[in-house]
Amino acid sequence: FNISGCSTKKLLWTYSTRSEEEFVLFCDLPEPQKSHFCHRNRLSPKQVPEHLPFMGSNDLSDVQWYQQPSNGDPLEDIRKSYPHIIQDKCTLHFLTPGVNNSGSYICRPKMIKSPYDVACCVKMILEVKPQTNASCEYSASHKQDLLLGSTGSISCPSLSCQSDAQSPAVTWYKNGKLLSVERSNRIVVDEVYDYHQGTYVCDYTQSDTVSSWTVRAVVQVRTIVGDTKLKPDILDPVEDTLEVELGKPLTISCKARFGFERVFNPVIKWYIKDSDLEWEVSVPEAKSIKSTLKDEIIERNIILEKVTQRDLRRKFVCFVQNSIGNTTQSVQLKEKR
Protein backbone atom coordinates (compact mmCIF):
# COMPACT_ATOMS: atom_id res chain seq x y z
CA PHE A 1 0.00 0.00 0.00
CA ASN A 2 1.05 3.60 -0.52
CA ILE A 3 2.49 5.10 2.66
CA SER A 4 2.88 8.62 1.31
CA GLY A 5 -0.50 9.55 2.80
CA CYS A 6 0.41 8.38 6.31
CA SER A 7 0.85 10.94 9.06
CA THR A 8 4.43 11.01 10.32
CA LYS A 9 5.78 11.10 13.85
CA LYS A 10 9.46 11.22 14.83
CA LEU A 11 10.60 9.52 18.02
CA LEU A 12 13.90 9.37 19.84
CA TRP A 13 15.02 6.55 22.13
CA THR A 14 18.15 7.34 24.09
CA TYR A 15 19.08 4.15 25.89
CA SER A 16 21.47 3.57 28.73
CA THR A 17 24.17 1.02 28.02
CA ARG A 18 24.19 0.21 31.76
CA SER A 19 20.66 -1.10 32.03
CA GLU A 20 18.35 -3.53 30.28
CA GLU A 21 15.51 -1.33 29.12
CA GLU A 22 12.70 -1.61 26.64
CA PHE A 23 10.85 0.75 24.35
CA VAL A 24 7.34 1.04 22.93
CA LEU A 25 5.59 2.52 19.94
CA PHE A 26 1.84 3.20 20.10
CA CYS A 27 -0.27 3.05 16.98
CA ASP A 28 -1.72 6.56 17.29
CA LEU A 29 -4.33 6.19 14.58
CA PRO A 30 -6.71 9.14 14.28
CA GLU A 31 -9.76 9.10 16.51
CA PRO A 32 -13.15 10.36 15.33
CA GLN A 33 -12.44 13.87 16.58
CA LYS A 34 -9.23 13.91 14.49
CA SER A 35 -10.96 12.37 11.51
CA HIS A 36 -9.76 15.07 9.11
CA PHE A 37 -6.52 13.13 8.78
CA CYS A 38 -8.00 9.87 7.55
CA HIS A 39 -10.22 11.80 5.17
CA ARG A 40 -7.98 14.64 4.12
CA ASN A 41 -6.94 13.00 0.85
CA ARG A 42 -10.47 12.00 -0.05
CA LEU A 43 -12.98 14.61 1.01
CA SER A 44 -13.45 18.31 0.69
CA PRO A 45 -14.47 20.03 3.99
CA LYS A 46 -18.11 20.14 2.80
CA GLN A 47 -18.35 16.43 2.17
CA VAL A 48 -19.40 14.19 5.03
CA PRO A 49 -18.30 10.58 5.27
CA GLU A 50 -21.11 8.07 5.47
CA HIS A 51 -19.51 6.32 8.47
CA LEU A 52 -17.04 7.12 11.20
CA PRO A 53 -13.37 6.61 10.37
CA PHE A 54 -11.80 3.28 11.22
CA MET A 55 -10.89 4.06 14.80
CA GLY A 56 -14.36 5.24 15.68
CA SER A 57 -15.93 1.84 16.04
CA ASN A 58 -13.08 -0.62 16.46
CA ASP A 59 -10.62 -1.21 19.20
CA LEU A 60 -6.94 -0.58 18.72
CA SER A 61 -5.94 -4.23 18.86
CA ASP A 62 -6.89 -4.60 15.22
CA VAL A 63 -3.82 -2.96 13.71
CA GLN A 64 -1.05 -4.25 11.51
CA TRP A 65 2.56 -3.13 11.94
CA TYR A 66 5.23 -3.00 9.24
CA GLN A 67 8.90 -2.12 9.12
CA GLN A 68 10.27 -0.10 6.22
CA PRO A 69 13.72 -1.39 5.23
CA SER A 70 16.26 1.39 4.84
CA ASN A 71 17.32 0.09 1.41
CA GLY A 72 13.90 0.88 -0.07
CA ASP A 73 12.70 -2.73 -0.23
CA PRO A 74 8.95 -3.40 0.21
CA LEU A 75 7.42 -3.11 3.67
CA GLU A 76 8.01 -6.13 5.94
CA ASP A 77 5.49 -7.57 8.38
CA ILE A 78 6.77 -6.80 11.88
CA ARG A 79 6.30 -10.44 12.88
CA LYS A 80 9.51 -11.17 10.97
CA SER A 81 11.36 -9.38 13.77
CA TYR A 82 9.97 -11.72 16.47
CA PRO A 83 11.11 -12.19 19.22
CA HIS A 84 13.11 -8.93 19.37
CA ILE A 85 10.00 -6.88 18.62
CA ILE A 86 6.59 -7.99 19.91
CA GLN A 87 3.13 -6.59 19.16
CA ASP A 88 0.55 -6.41 21.93
CA LYS A 89 -2.75 -4.73 21.06
CA CYS A 90 -1.78 -1.43 19.40
CA THR A 91 1.65 -1.36 21.02
CA LEU A 92 4.96 -2.47 19.60
CA HIS A 93 7.46 -3.58 22.27
CA PHE A 94 11.19 -3.45 21.59
CA LEU A 95 12.85 -5.90 23.97
CA THR A 96 16.51 -5.08 23.38
CA PRO A 97 17.99 -1.62 22.96
CA GLY A 98 20.35 -0.93 20.07
CA VAL A 99 20.86 1.42 17.15
CA ASN A 100 19.75 -1.39 14.82
CA ASN A 101 16.18 -0.62 15.99
CA SER A 102 16.39 2.74 14.23
CA GLY A 103 14.12 2.96 11.22
CA SER A 104 10.57 3.54 10.06
CA TYR A 105 7.60 1.66 11.49
CA ILE A 106 4.16 1.88 9.95
CA CYS A 107 0.85 0.90 11.49
CA ARG A 108 -2.56 0.78 9.91
CA PRO A 109 -5.93 -0.93 10.40
CA LYS A 110 -6.03 -4.64 9.63
CA MET A 111 -9.51 -4.35 8.16
CA ILE A 112 -9.83 -1.73 5.46
CA LYS A 113 -13.58 -1.15 5.39
CA SER A 114 -13.77 1.71 2.90
CA PRO A 115 -11.59 3.75 0.55
CA TYR A 116 -11.28 6.38 3.29
CA ASP A 117 -9.42 3.95 5.54
CA VAL A 118 -6.58 3.43 3.06
CA ALA A 119 -4.88 6.65 4.15
CA CYS A 120 -5.55 5.87 7.82
CA CYS A 121 -1.99 5.02 8.82
CA VAL A 122 0.88 6.36 10.87
CA LYS A 123 4.55 6.26 9.99
CA MET A 124 6.91 6.47 12.94
CA ILE A 125 10.52 7.35 12.34
CA LEU A 126 12.49 5.99 15.27
CA GLU A 127 16.01 7.11 16.03
CA VAL A 128 17.89 5.09 18.62
CA LYS A 129 21.04 6.42 20.29
CA PRO A 130 23.15 5.28 23.23
CA GLN A 131 23.09 7.77 26.09
CA THR A 132 26.25 9.83 26.41
CA ASN A 133 27.72 9.61 29.90
CA ALA A 134 28.08 13.38 30.03
CA SER A 135 24.36 13.99 29.61
CA CYS A 136 23.31 12.97 33.09
CA GLU A 137 25.10 10.99 35.73
CA TYR A 138 22.15 10.37 38.03
CA SER A 139 19.29 9.79 35.61
CA ALA A 140 16.30 7.92 37.02
CA SER A 141 16.20 4.20 36.52
CA HIS A 142 13.95 2.43 34.02
CA LYS A 143 12.94 0.21 36.92
CA GLN A 144 11.47 2.10 39.86
CA ASP A 145 9.95 0.85 43.12
CA LEU A 146 7.10 2.35 45.12
CA LEU A 147 6.71 1.43 48.77
CA LEU A 148 3.13 0.32 49.49
CA GLY A 149 1.25 2.58 51.91
CA SER A 150 3.74 5.44 51.67
CA THR A 151 4.14 8.46 49.40
CA GLY A 152 6.30 8.08 46.35
CA SER A 153 7.07 9.40 42.89
CA ILE A 154 7.77 8.11 39.40
CA SER A 155 10.42 10.03 37.48
CA CYS A 156 10.81 10.30 33.73
CA PRO A 157 14.34 8.94 33.10
CA SER A 158 15.09 11.22 30.17
CA LEU A 159 14.18 14.31 32.22
CA SER A 160 15.20 13.40 35.74
CA CYS A 161 18.27 15.64 35.66
CA GLN A 162 16.17 18.74 35.00
CA SER A 163 14.42 20.74 37.67
CA ASP A 164 10.61 20.87 37.60
CA ALA A 165 10.83 24.55 36.60
CA GLN A 166 12.87 23.99 33.42
CA SER A 167 11.18 20.72 32.46
CA PRO A 168 9.01 20.69 29.31
CA ALA A 169 5.42 19.45 29.36
CA VAL A 170 5.39 15.66 29.64
CA THR A 171 2.76 13.23 28.40
CA TRP A 172 2.43 10.13 30.56
CA TYR A 173 0.86 6.74 29.78
CA LYS A 174 0.25 3.82 32.12
CA ASN A 175 -0.16 0.37 30.59
CA GLY A 176 -0.82 2.09 27.25
CA LYS A 177 -3.54 4.46 28.54
CA LEU A 178 -3.06 8.22 28.58
CA LEU A 179 -2.80 9.81 32.05
CA SER A 180 -4.32 13.13 31.03
CA VAL A 181 -3.80 14.96 34.33
CA GLU A 182 -0.07 14.33 34.56
CA ARG A 183 2.09 16.92 32.76
CA SER A 184 5.24 17.18 34.88
CA ASN A 185 8.49 15.19 34.67
CA ARG A 186 7.51 13.44 37.92
CA ILE A 187 4.29 11.75 38.97
CA VAL A 188 3.74 12.19 42.70
CA VAL A 189 1.77 9.43 44.43
CA ASP A 190 0.22 10.46 47.75
CA GLU A 191 -0.39 6.90 48.90
CA VAL A 192 0.94 3.88 47.05
CA TYR A 193 -1.45 1.03 46.28
CA ASP A 194 -0.88 -2.19 44.35
CA TYR A 195 -2.64 -0.74 41.29
CA HIS A 196 0.14 1.84 40.87
CA GLN A 197 2.28 -0.99 39.56
CA GLY A 198 2.67 -1.09 35.80
CA THR A 199 4.46 0.07 32.66
CA TYR A 200 4.70 3.85 32.46
CA VAL A 201 5.75 5.80 29.37
CA CYS A 202 6.81 9.45 29.40
CA ASP A 203 7.01 11.63 26.28
CA TYR A 204 8.19 15.17 25.73
CA THR A 205 8.94 17.20 22.62
CA GLN A 206 12.43 18.28 21.68
CA SER A 207 12.81 20.75 18.83
CA ASP A 208 15.66 22.19 16.84
CA THR A 209 15.59 24.61 13.92
CA VAL A 210 14.80 21.85 11.43
CA SER A 211 12.30 19.50 13.10
CA SER A 212 10.78 18.28 16.33
CA TRP A 213 11.04 14.85 17.94
CA THR A 214 9.15 13.06 20.65
CA VAL A 215 11.64 11.83 23.25
CA ARG A 216 10.25 8.72 24.92
CA ALA A 217 11.25 6.56 27.87
CA VAL A 218 9.66 3.49 29.44
CA VAL A 219 9.60 2.91 33.20
CA GLN A 220 8.64 -0.35 34.87
CA VAL A 221 7.13 0.49 38.26
CA ARG A 222 6.90 -2.15 40.95
CA THR A 223 4.92 -1.81 44.16
CA ILE A 224 6.78 -3.39 47.05
CA VAL A 225 6.69 -3.77 50.80
CA GLY A 226 9.53 -2.47 52.95
CA ASP A 227 12.63 -4.61 53.39
CA THR A 228 12.34 -7.14 56.17
CA LYS A 229 13.98 -6.44 59.52
CA LEU A 230 14.04 -10.13 60.40
CA LYS A 231 16.43 -12.94 59.66
CA PRO A 232 14.85 -15.95 57.89
CA ASP A 233 13.05 -18.55 59.95
CA ILE A 234 13.14 -22.30 59.38
CA LEU A 235 9.68 -23.85 59.04
CA ASP A 236 10.89 -27.41 58.55
CA PRO A 237 12.46 -29.47 60.08
CA VAL A 238 10.82 -28.59 63.38
CA GLU A 239 12.11 -31.53 65.43
CA ASP A 240 15.79 -32.02 66.14
CA THR A 241 15.57 -35.81 65.89
CA LEU A 242 14.27 -37.96 63.07
CA GLU A 243 13.51 -41.67 63.18
CA VAL A 244 14.98 -43.56 60.23
CA GLU A 245 15.49 -47.11 58.94
CA LEU A 246 19.04 -48.23 58.29
CA GLY A 247 19.80 -49.13 54.66
CA LYS A 248 16.83 -47.15 53.33
CA PRO A 249 17.03 -43.94 51.25
CA LEU A 250 16.19 -40.70 53.05
CA THR A 251 15.28 -37.16 52.03
CA ILE A 252 15.31 -34.39 54.61
CA SER A 253 13.67 -31.16 53.57
CA CYS A 254 14.62 -27.72 54.81
CA LYS A 255 11.98 -25.06 54.27
CA ALA A 256 12.69 -21.47 55.24
CA ARG A 257 10.71 -18.24 55.04
CA PHE A 258 12.58 -15.16 53.81
CA GLY A 259 11.06 -11.70 54.21
CA PHE A 260 11.02 -9.35 51.22
CA GLU A 261 14.27 -7.60 50.36
CA ARG A 262 14.79 -5.33 47.39
CA VAL A 263 18.20 -6.88 46.88
CA PHE A 264 17.35 -10.51 47.51
CA ASN A 265 20.25 -12.93 47.99
CA PRO A 266 18.88 -15.82 50.04
CA VAL A 267 21.22 -18.55 51.24
CA ILE A 268 19.95 -22.02 52.09
CA LYS A 269 22.36 -24.91 52.46
CA TRP A 270 22.98 -28.17 54.27
CA TYR A 271 26.13 -29.16 56.07
CA ILE A 272 27.13 -32.16 58.15
CA LYS A 273 28.80 -32.14 61.58
CA ASP A 274 30.76 -35.21 62.59
CA SER A 275 32.61 -34.81 65.89
CA ASP A 276 34.99 -31.89 65.25
CA LEU A 277 34.57 -31.88 61.50
CA GLU A 278 31.92 -30.11 59.47
CA TRP A 279 31.45 -29.84 55.71
CA GLU A 280 28.91 -28.53 53.25
CA VAL A 281 26.97 -31.11 51.28
CA SER A 282 26.29 -30.78 47.55
CA VAL A 283 22.52 -31.11 47.33
CA PRO A 284 19.89 -30.38 44.66
CA GLU A 285 19.18 -26.74 43.82
CA ALA A 286 16.96 -24.76 46.16
CA LYS A 287 13.48 -24.00 44.87
CA SER A 288 10.91 -21.37 45.65
CA ILE A 289 7.71 -23.09 46.75
CA LYS A 290 5.62 -20.04 47.68
CA SER A 291 6.02 -16.38 46.88
CA THR A 292 3.91 -13.51 48.18
CA LEU A 293 4.31 -9.76 48.34
CA LYS A 294 5.80 -9.98 51.85
CA ASP A 295 7.85 -13.15 51.81
CA GLU A 296 9.12 -16.18 49.98
CA ILE A 297 9.37 -19.79 51.10
CA ILE A 298 12.38 -21.63 49.76
CA GLU A 299 13.05 -25.36 50.06
CA ARG A 300 16.24 -27.37 49.74
CA ASN A 301 16.56 -31.11 50.27
CA ILE A 302 19.39 -33.32 51.37
CA ILE A 303 19.23 -36.82 49.87
CA LEU A 304 20.90 -39.90 51.38
CA GLU A 305 20.99 -42.92 49.09
CA LYS A 306 20.87 -45.17 52.12
CA VAL A 307 21.16 -44.44 55.80
CA THR A 308 24.29 -45.93 57.38
CA GLN A 309 25.35 -46.48 60.97
CA ARG A 310 27.81 -43.62 60.54
CA ASP A 311 24.93 -41.24 59.67
CA LEU A 312 23.43 -41.87 63.11
CA ARG A 313 26.48 -40.29 64.70
CA ARG A 314 26.27 -37.16 62.54
CA LYS A 315 24.26 -33.99 62.77
CA PHE A 316 22.61 -32.68 59.61
CA VAL A 317 22.40 -28.90 59.77
CA CYS A 318 20.26 -26.62 57.61
CA PHE A 319 21.72 -23.11 57.41
CA VAL A 320 19.70 -20.14 56.10
CA GLN A 321 20.75 -16.53 55.75
CA ASN A 322 19.67 -13.15 54.44
CA SER A 323 21.21 -9.67 54.81
CA ILE A 324 19.96 -9.41 58.42
CA GLY A 325 21.35 -12.65 59.80
CA ASN A 326 21.26 -16.43 59.79
CA THR A 327 19.41 -19.30 61.43
CA THR A 328 20.25 -22.99 61.73
CA GLN A 329 18.34 -26.12 62.54
CA SER A 330 20.13 -29.41 63.18
CA VAL A 331 18.70 -32.90 62.86
CA GLN A 332 20.05 -36.03 64.54
CA LEU A 333 19.04 -39.35 62.97
CA LYS A 334 17.75 -42.07 65.28
CA GLU A 335 17.18 -45.70 64.32
CA LYS A 336 13.54 -46.81 64.30
CA ARG A 337 12.90 -49.51 66.89
Partner: nanobody, 117 residues
Framework: QLQLVESGGGLVQAGGSLRLSCAAS?????????MGWYRQAPGKQRELVAS???????NYVDSVKGRATISRDNAKKTVYLQMNSLKPEDTAVYYC??????????LGQGTLVTVSS
Amino acid sequence: QLQLVESGGGLVQAGGSLRLSCAASRSITFSHNVMGWYRQAPGKQRELVASIGSGGSTNYVDSVKGRATISRDNAKKTVYLQMNSLKPEDTAVYYCGVVVGVYRGSLGQGTLVTVSS
Protein backbone atom coordinates in the same frame (compact mmCIF):
# COMPACT_ATOMS: atom_id res chain seq x y z
CA GLN B 1 8.30 -11.08 43.85
CA LEU B 2 6.41 -13.01 41.24
CA GLN B 3 6.22 -16.77 41.30
CA LEU B 4 5.46 -18.79 38.17
CA VAL B 5 4.76 -22.51 38.40
CA GLU B 6 4.68 -24.73 35.30
CA SER B 7 3.06 -28.13 34.95
CA GLY B 8 2.09 -30.58 32.23
CA GLY B 9 5.47 -31.76 31.00
CA GLY B 10 6.34 -35.39 30.56
CA LEU B 11 7.30 -38.14 28.15
CA VAL B 12 5.32 -38.26 24.92
CA GLN B 13 5.71 -40.12 21.64
CA ALA B 14 6.51 -38.30 18.41
CA GLY B 15 3.30 -37.07 16.82
CA GLY B 16 1.61 -36.76 20.21
CA SER B 17 0.32 -33.71 22.07
CA LEU B 18 0.90 -31.96 25.39
CA ARG B 19 -0.69 -29.04 27.19
CA LEU B 20 1.57 -27.02 29.46
CA SER B 21 0.15 -24.72 32.14
CA CYS B 22 1.72 -21.90 34.10
CA ALA B 23 0.16 -20.25 37.13
CA ALA B 24 1.28 -16.83 38.39
CA SER B 25 1.11 -15.64 41.98
CA ARG B 26 0.00 -12.01 41.42
CA SER B 27 -2.93 -10.90 39.28
CA ILE B 28 -2.16 -7.17 39.25
CA THR B 29 1.10 -8.01 37.52
CA PHE B 30 -0.21 -10.75 35.29
CA SER B 31 -2.95 -9.04 33.31
CA HIS B 32 -0.77 -6.26 31.84
CA ASN B 33 2.15 -8.46 30.90
CA VAL B 34 3.15 -10.14 27.68
CA MET B 35 3.61 -13.71 28.87
CA GLY B 36 5.59 -16.35 27.04
CA TRP B 37 6.92 -19.87 26.88
CA TYR B 38 10.65 -20.36 26.50
CA ARG B 39 12.48 -23.63 25.97
CA GLN B 40 16.01 -24.80 26.41
CA ALA B 41 17.24 -28.00 24.80
CA PRO B 42 20.39 -29.66 26.18
CA GLY B 43 23.49 -27.74 25.10
CA LYS B 44 21.46 -25.01 23.40
CA GLN B 45 20.50 -21.44 24.26
CA ARG B 46 17.11 -20.67 25.70
CA GLU B 47 14.64 -19.48 23.03
CA LEU B 48 11.27 -17.75 23.18
CA VAL B 49 8.85 -20.19 21.57
CA ALA B 50 5.55 -18.32 21.87
CA SER B 51 4.15 -15.21 23.52
CA ILE B 52 0.74 -13.75 24.21
CA GLY B 53 -0.10 -10.13 24.87
CA SER B 54 -2.54 -8.71 27.39
CA GLY B 55 -5.03 -8.31 24.55
CA GLY B 56 -4.54 -11.86 23.33
CA SER B 57 -2.27 -11.20 20.33
CA THR B 58 0.02 -14.18 19.80
CA ASN B 59 3.43 -14.74 18.25
CA TYR B 60 5.32 -17.96 17.53
CA VAL B 61 8.83 -18.89 16.55
CA ASP B 62 8.92 -20.44 13.04
CA SER B 63 9.79 -23.95 14.25
CA VAL B 64 6.46 -24.34 16.13
CA LYS B 65 4.11 -22.32 13.89
CA GLY B 66 0.99 -24.32 13.08
CA ARG B 67 1.73 -26.85 15.84
CA ALA B 68 1.60 -24.67 18.96
CA THR B 69 -1.16 -22.55 20.45
CA ILE B 70 -0.57 -20.18 23.36
CA SER B 71 -3.54 -18.90 25.37
CA ARG B 72 -4.18 -17.16 28.67
CA ASP B 73 -6.84 -16.84 31.34
CA ASN B 74 -6.31 -13.57 33.23
CA ALA B 75 -8.92 -14.46 35.85
CA LYS B 76 -7.02 -17.64 36.71
CA LYS B 77 -3.62 -15.89 36.26
CA THR B 78 -2.66 -18.78 34.00
CA VAL B 79 -1.01 -19.12 30.61
CA TYR B 80 -1.13 -22.32 28.51
CA LEU B 81 0.84 -23.85 25.66
CA GLN B 82 -0.82 -26.55 23.58
CA MET B 83 1.75 -28.46 21.52
CA ASN B 84 0.60 -30.85 18.78
CA SER B 85 2.46 -33.09 16.29
CA LEU B 86 5.43 -33.15 18.65
CA LYS B 87 8.87 -33.94 17.23
CA PRO B 88 12.00 -35.27 18.96
CA GLU B 89 13.57 -31.83 18.44
CA ASP B 90 10.87 -30.34 20.71
CA THR B 91 12.57 -32.13 23.63
CA ALA B 92 13.58 -29.43 26.11
CA VAL B 93 12.87 -27.86 29.46
CA TYR B 94 9.95 -25.46 28.92
CA TYR B 95 9.82 -22.32 31.04
CA CYS B 96 7.00 -19.88 31.48
CA GLY B 97 8.07 -16.27 31.80
CA VAL B 98 7.27 -12.57 31.66
CA VAL B 99 8.39 -11.30 28.25
CA VAL B 100 7.25 -7.69 28.68
CA GLY B 101 6.16 -6.02 31.89
CA VAL B 102 7.14 -5.14 35.42
CA TYR B 103 8.57 -8.57 36.22
CA ARG B 104 10.22 -9.02 32.83
CA GLY B 105 12.78 -11.81 33.02
CA SER B 106 10.91 -13.71 35.75
CA LEU B 107 10.87 -17.40 34.89
CA GLY B 108 9.37 -20.50 36.46
CA GLN B 109 11.39 -23.56 37.49
CA GLY B 110 10.64 -25.27 34.18
CA THR B 111 8.92 -28.49 33.13
CA LEU B 112 10.68 -31.17 31.10
CA VAL B 113 9.15 -32.31 27.82
CA THR B 114 10.70 -35.42 26.30
CA VAL B 115 9.58 -36.54 22.84
CA SER B 116 10.61 -40.09 21.99
CA SER B 117 10.84 -41.36 18.44
